[in-house]
Interface confidence: medium
């Protein structure tokens, strides 16, 4: 380690985990508690992120790296670096302004987050429905009727429901 200071910027030799202390003859002082510097040559240390409330600590802050948060059970991360926590729903539901709602008929959600997506339209690919879709699962498309061997039959798509359910489970 070259301990001679740069003539241009004496702070350039200060490593991560320190700040260049102008009040103390520009020595490299350790970052104070609850702060960090992830790069060298910094004149201040950054305040550590605090994982509070619905956020929980995934990685503690150190003198060289910020804390990382994730979400408490029942919530999931949104945004860069988990900047927000959004409520989980059940599979077969999506989060609306009024809370978790069942997927409308013809749509599904196989995760606890995100929105309900339409079932695959098998006929667009010239295929038939092999397994019906549900609120939690997409349809499974099978071979086209022309590909079926004699005597085989495709599953008949279900008749549409009169009114999709919207009551939360």
């Amino acid at each position: 380690f070259e301990r001679t200071r740069s003539l241009q910027d004496p702070c350039s030799n200060c490593p991560a985990g320190t700040f260049c202390d102008n009040n103390r003859n520009q020595i490299c002082s350790p970052c104070p508690p609850n702060s960090f510097s992830s790069a060298g040559g910094q004149r201040t240390c950054d305040i550590c992120r605090q994982c509070k409330g619905v956020f929980r600590t995934r990685k503690e802050c150190s003198s060289t790296s910020n804390a990382e948060c994730d979400c408490t059970p029942g919530f999931h991360c949104l945004g860069a670096g988990c900047s927000m926590c959004e409520q989980d729903c059940k599979q077969g539901q999506e989060l609306t302004k009024k809370g978790c709602k069942d997927c409308c008929f013809g749509t599904f959600n196989d995760q606890k987050r995100g929105i309900c997506r339409p079932w695959t339209n098998c006929s667009l690919d010239g295929k038939s429905v092999l397994v019906n879709g549900t609120k939690e699962r997409d349809v499974v498309c099978g071979p086209s009727p022309a590909d079926l061997s004699p005597g085989a039959s495709s599953v008949t798509p279900p008749a549409p429901a009169r009114e999709p359910g919207h009551s939360p489970q």
Partner: antibody, heavy 118, light 107 residues
Framework: EVKLLESGGGLVQPGGSLKLSCAAS????????MSWVRQAPGKGLEWIGE????????NYTPSLKDKFIISRDNAKNTLYLQMSKVRSEDTALYYC???????????WGQGTTLTVSS | DIVMTQSPATLSVTPGDRVSLSCRAS??????LHWYQQKSHESPRLLIK???QSISGIPPRFSGSGSGSDFTLSINSVEPEDVGMYYC?????????FGAGTKLELK
């Protein structure tokens, strides 16, 4: 259990040199700043200097920076204090200390004694 | 360098007493003030960090207060094993400095 064990002290003639060691165990040595602090007989505590976890910054109390060199070997979990041109006023008990997040000395060794005498 | 002044130099106490040890910094150091206990022929031991934060394993009878330049270490019911030297330390400035200490002894 955090343990710090200094060694290498002894009787040295004025103008001589000596290297003290501090063996660390019970914690991740490579993640902590480490310091040396000394205590002259019947006197208070005097901070000597500190070293960054990866040795990329080393700070000394200004009056001692030309005669002491602090180093560390993370592979051996060991901190060192190289002393040169020692004088009678360097006679003291030398402690190594772990620095918690800056300059809180949360664990101390038992100390090793340097006696400078002709 | 910042000068740390401790008072009194010696404090004679009776077990069960509540005592206060003072530490004054020559300029403001915010709450970057740490207290150590050193018993005879032993190493220093961290008692309080950042003026008032307790340390795991330290008996709750030890507490700290203060900010800026005036700080106090309190022992709310002195035990015989508390005799020894008590040092305050400035962790804010460079170089970090210790007070000269307060000697706690039994009457």
């Amino acid at each position: 259990e955090v343990k710090l064990l200094e060694s290498g002290g002894g009787l040295v003639q004025p103008g001589g040199s000596l290297k003290l060691s501090c063996a660390a165990s019970g914690f991740d040595f490579s993640r902590y700043w480490m310091s040396w602090v000394r205590q002259a007989p019947g006197k208070g505590l005097e901070w000597i200097g500190e070293i960054h976890p990866d040795s990329s910054a080393i700070n000394y109390t200004p009056s001692l920076k030309d005669k002491f060199i602090i180093s560390r070997d993370n592979a051996k979990n060991t901190l060192y204090l190289q002393m040169s041109k020692v004088r009678s006023e360097d006679t003291a008990l030398y402690y190594c200390a772990r620095s918690y997040y800056g300059r809180v000395f949360d664990y101390w060794g038992q100390g090793t004694t340097l006696t400078v005498s002709s | 360098d910042i000068v740390m002044t401790q008072s009194p130099a010696t404090l004679s106490v009776t077990p069960g007493d509540r005592v206060s040890l003072s530490c004054r910094a020559s300029q403001s150091i915010s709450d970057y003030l740490h207290w150590y206990q050193q018993k005879s022929h032993e190493s220093p031991r961290l008692l309080i960090k950042y003026a008032s934060q307790s340390i795991s394993g330290i008996p709750p009878r030890f507490s700290g207060s203060g900010s800026g330049s005036d700080f106090t270490l309190s022992i709310n019911s002195v035990e015989p094993e508390d005799v020894g030297m008590y040092y305050c330390q400035d962790g804010h400035s460079f170089p970090p400095t210790f007070g000269a200490g307060t000697k706690l002894e039994l009457k």
